[in-house]
């Protein structure tokens, strides 16, 4: 759950308690079981860009 009083995440992103920040739903491609991915199921993700470390 997002901490009370914090701004909601922008469209195409979802709150991660594991990371304590909003995460881009496109990241669910890498790790579909990330905690924030549940919040992404309701809204379509932002356009995905392949990123390399």
């Amino acid at each position: 759950e997002q901490a009370p009083g914090t701004a909601p995440c922008s469209r195409g992103s979802s709150w991660s308690a594991d990371l304590d920040k909003c995460m881009d739903c496109a990241s669910c491609r890498a790790r579909p079981h990330s905690d924030f991915c549940l919040g992404c199921a309701a809204a379509p993700p932002a356009p995905f860009r392949l990123l390399w470390p």
């Epitope: 990371l19 995460m23 990241s27 491609r29 790790r31 990330s34 390399w52 470390p53």
Partner: antibody
Framework: QVQLVQSGAEVKKPGASVKISCKVS????????IAWVKQAPGKGLEWIGE????????YYSEKFRGKATLTADKSTSTAYMELSSLRSEDTAVYYC?????????????WGQGTTVTVSS | DIVMTQSPLSLPVTPGEPASISCRSS???????????LYWYLQKPGQSPQLLIY???NLASGVPDRFSSSGSGTDFTLKISRVEAEDVGVYYC?????????FGGGTKVEIK
Amino acid sequence: QVQLVQSGAEVKKPGASVKISCKVSGYTFTDFIIAWVKQAPGKGLEWIGEIYPGTGRTYYSEKFRGKATLTADKSTSTAYMELSSLRSEDTAVYYCARRTIYYDYDGDYWGQGTTVTVSS
Amino acid sequence: DIVMTQSPLSLPVTPGEPASISCRSSKSLLHSSGITYLYWYLQKPGQSPQLLIYQMSNLASGVPDRFSSSGSGTDFTLKISRVEAEDVGVYYCAHNLELPWTFGGGTKVEIK
């Protein structure tokens, strides 16, 4: 470049504890998960658990819950795994591995491994 | 937990010849996104595991294109088109669909 450097080999007596470290460099420590994997002599790979270094949140394999404790020190970019109540079956090489949250592939960097030997 | 089963246990190979390793998962690794969360790792003698293939068919950075992988939701094959001496080691399949992260038992590839 990305590096995960683990602490040296340990020899412990049954019942003792051991704490091994994994110092990372070349990337932002809090941006990736650190997983720990066991490889017993002549055996395969077994996931122990993983930690989000930024928040300290952990996930464990049921098998290792109560055996392993994962922690992280953001100030030194170091992850730790403590193994308690050591038995002979804990003799193994233990690896830390960086697991991605952001990219399309996963587990792309591993430490060199730490050998733990439990012997009386 | 998802069980990953590999075969064969051991694979003697001739340099220059093709080789293939099979992996089966106890649950489909095909996600609703269309991505199949199957990974292949190689552990060379005395080394840490290294990623070869991610999401069933994508070569990791620096991996030669003689390696390829294909499959369905539960049955997968890693192919080496022409085995080289440097390809020896233990190959592991793994999934990244959910926790726990599980690996196959490994296939040891050795030169005949």
